[in-house]
């Protein structure tokens, strides 16, 4: 029986050209996290495996950094980065948990409320 829940940063906004951290947290389960996949719509961005560590998709290597923790840092944001992001937790013995984050990348003048998600 799957008892866990995924907590995410929810709907967030950030400035064009800036950076942002995508974070998910799995709670309320003792299941072992074996792997976390990060996806943007229909694209695999990165994988963090308990044994193998991080794999960043080559096409995103310049703008995606692993961490902190099981999270993902997106850099040099563009308007095209706006959209849904998914963290997919593969666990044993529970199975798969999925969290969703919606990121809106705005021109700097309108992204003030997203500033607290920025990396200094």
């Amino acid at each position: 029986m799957m008892t866990g829940t995924i907590e995410t940063t929810g709907n967030i906004s950030a400035e064009k050209g800036g950076s942002i951290i995508l974070q998910c947290h799995l709670s309320s389960t003792t299941a072992q996290v074996t792997q976390v996949n990060w996806e943007q719509q229909d694209q695999l961005l990165a994988i963090c495996n308990a044994d193998l560590g991080w794999h960043i998709s080559p096409s995103f290597k310049d703008r995606v950094a692993p961490g902190p923790g099981l999270g993902l840092t997106l850099q040099s944001l563009t308007v095209n980065d706006t959209g849904e992001y998914f963290c997919i937790y593969h666990t044993y013995p529970d199975g798969t948990y999925t969290g969703r984050i919606f990121l809106e990348v705005l021109e700097s003048s309108v992204a003030e409320h997203g500033a607290r998600f920025q990396i200094p």
Epitope: Q43, H55, Y92
Partner: antibody
Framework: EVQLLESGGGLVQPGGSLRLSCAAS????????MHWVRQAPGKGLEWVSG????????SYADSVKGRFTISRDNSKNTLYLQMNSLRAEDTAVYYC???????????WGQGTLVTVSS | DIQMTQSPSSLSASVGDRVTITCRAS??????LNWYQQKPGKAPKLLIY???SLQSGVPSRFSGSGSGTDFTLTISSLQPEDFATYYC?????????FGGGTKVEIK
């Protein structure tokens, strides 16, 4: 250098059993998921079974479920496929493959031929 | 189960030709799509993983694209050693499934 070497294939009668082995070297075997894939003579590739790095999670194709068992011994760097109640349609070359991140098979063995015939 | 439909099943081409092979999934598989090359009597070889990532050591004339349900393998300039059978494979969910293969033959 990554190497995967299958063994244990051969001729067996319908209803019989075989155990295939895949000896791994050149990498940290215990860190990788491993899969078995087969190919019937003149046919395409068919996934058979997969196992997680620690052996805790396994999955099977419907065509072999209940008859085949995948396992691994990380202390011996070896992957196994126990095949019971073999049928003529199980005749194929069986490949083991290393599957990083459980997503792609980056190294394959040379294969071992299993022939089920009376 | 997710069905993978590959086309064409075979094609004839000449050295230097641009070759395109397509693969369609019966449901969205994000970018969990891999391409393999197989020569007679040999094990498959990974060319492209996660739809568009070139495996280390594979020539850059091979490229992959697509996401969701429709994917393409392109060989920009066919070389003599590229005559082989190519398979797509989804790793989105088990059971993992392969396309039926595309045999690339010399014209």
């Amino acid at each position: 250098e990554v190497q995967l070497l299958e063994s244990g294939g051969g001729l067996v009668q319908p209803g019989g059993s075989l155990r295939l082995s895949c000896a791994a070297s050149g990498f940290t075997f215990s860190s990788y998921a491993m899969h078995w894939v087969r190919q019937a003579p003149g046919k395409g590739l068919e996934w058979v079974s997969g196992i997680s790095s620690n052996g805790g999670s396994t999955s099977y194709a419907d065509s072999v479920k209940g008859r085949f068992t995948i396992s691994r011994d990380n202390s011996k760097n070896t992957l196994y496929l126990q095949m019971n109640s073999l049928r003529a349609e199980d005749t194929a070359v069986y490949y083991c493959a290393r599957v990083p991140y459980s997503v792609w098979a980056d190294y394959w063995g040379q294969g071992t031929l299993v022939t089920v015939s009376s | 189960d997710i069905q993978m439909t590959q086309s064409p099943s075979s094609l004839s081409a000449s050295v230097g030709d641009r070759v395109t092979i397509t693969c369609r999934a019966s449901q969205s598989i994000s970018s969990y799509l891999n391409w393999y090359q197989q020569k007679p009597g040999k094990a498959p070889k990974l060319l492209i993983y996660a739809a568009s990532s070139l495996q280390s050591g594979v020539p850059s004339r091979f490229s992959g694209s697509g996401s969701g349900t429709d994917f393409t393998l392109t060989i920009s300039s066919l070389q003599p050693e590229d005559f082989a059978t190519y398979y797509c494979q989804q790793s989105y969910s088990t059971p993992l499934t392969f396309g039926g293969g595309t045999k690339v033959e010399i014209k």
